[in-house]
């Protein structure tokens, strides 16, 4: 059976760059170590954003450099992604990668568009 | 670039052991998960045996099961498949193979044959 | 393990036409999960379509996949000299991963 991953059509970062959405999964098998990693597609070229492997129950460890953070509850990811700019608006692709016990599965989500919008700078103040 | 370069191929007789190595380069290889595909004289593909990111969860098929072992060295950029008990069933070009980000194979190397024959 | 069945086994076909391969699985794969590759004699098999229908970087768009479930499609449009070879579905969603037994593509 493939699996079947979830995610919102549409996301807003609010004004300081920053976006959260939930990746959800079908979990075809009862999975103890799981990697979720959020990809970018823009054209059709596509690049990792960030990625974490995890224990179920155990929290998301991101790389520090990372500009995702996450929590994970069941077969539910949330997802956390800072520091964006209007350069980075595009499609977010979250794919789920079920790595233990046997069988291996994966899933990919049909990706979230993230919009961002850069604040104004403040008017100076006389 | 992205390279796949598969070297250790060669004529051994059944019963003995091998060991293939695959070089990467042009790009982060501990990003990626890999594979080794086979392919007999004259036939289809065959999926043999997979590796995860960082080595620890390993997937292989039943006909190579408890004989072959994929390892990386994640340090050097280096996929491996040692080979154990061959059997002539198991002449084949052998080729390493990147998953890409959405799942598919997609770069290979150029395959290393592989003649288990006495 | 998921079975993937291709036919024809072979196709003689002249360049200019239209080549239509199947790929059929025995059991549901989803869409995003069903590869093609090509395989030229002395070289290794190349990603032409992923995701049942996207090409993959530089693949002329001739090429196009389509299906869903358990039933998919390569089909190549207007046959080149280049396309002649052997086509291989995949199924890549869970283990094993899994092969067709390839559809050669022959001139007629």
């Known amino acids: 059976k493939a699996m079947h991953v979830a995610q919102p059509a549409v996301v807003l970062a609010n004004s300081r760059g920053t976006a959260s959405f939930v990746c959800e999964y079908a979990s075809p098998g009862k999975a103890t170590e799981v990697r979720v990693t959020v990809l970018r597609q823009a054209d059709s070229q596509v690049t990792e954003v960030c990625a974490a492997t995890y224990m179920m129950g155990n929290e998301l460890t991101f790389l520090d450099d990372s500009i995702c953070t996450g929590t994970s509850s069941g077969n539910q990811v949330n997802l956390t992604i800072q520091g964006l700019r209007a350069m980075d608006t595009g499609l977010y692709i979250c794919k789920v990668e079920l790595m233990y016990p046997p069988p291996y599965y994966m899933g990919i989500g049909n990706g979230t568009q993230i919009y961002v919008i850069d604040p104004e700078p403040c008017p100076d103040s006389d | 670039q992205v390279q796949l370069v598969e070297s250790g191929g060669g004529v051994v007789q059944p019963g003995r052991s091998l060991r293939l190595s695959c070089a990467a380069s042009?790009?982060?290889?501990?990003?990626?998960?890999m594979h080794w595909v086979r392919q007999a004289p004259g036939k289809g593909l065959e999926w043999v045996t997979f590796i995860s990111y960082d080595g620890n969860n390993k997937y292989y098929a039943d006909s190579v099961k408890g004989r072959f072992t994929i390892s990386r060295d994640n340090s050097k950029n280096t996929l491996y498949l040692q080979m154990n008990s061959l059997r002539a069933e198991d002449t084949a070009i052998y080729y390493c193979?990147?998953?890409?980000?959405?799942?598919?194979?997609?770069?290979w190397g150029q395959g290393t044959l592989v003649t288990v024959s006495s | 393990e998921i079975v993937l069945t291709q036919s024809p086994g072979t196709l003689s076909l002249s360049p200019g036409e239209r080549a239509t391969l199947s790929c059929r699985a025995s059991?549901?794969?989803?869409?995003?999960?069903l590869a093609w590759y090509q395989q030229k004699p002395g070289q290794a098999p190349r990603l032409l379509i992923y995701g049942a229908f996207s090409r993959a970087t530089g693949i002329p768009d001739r090429f196009s996949g389509s299906g869903s479930g358990t039933d998919f499609t390569l089909t190549i449009s207007r046959l080149e000299p280049e396309d002649f070879a052997v086509y291989y579905c995949?199924?890549?969603?869970?283990?094993?991963?899994?092969f067709g037994q390839g559809t050669k593509v022959e001139i007629k």
């Open positions: 193979a990147r998953t890409g980000w959405l799942g598919p194979f997609d770069y």
């Open positions: 059991q549901e794969v989803g869409e995003s999960y």
């Open positions: 042009g790009f982060t290889f501990s990003h990626y998960t």
């Open positions: 995949q199924q890549y969603g869970s283990s094993p991963w899994t």
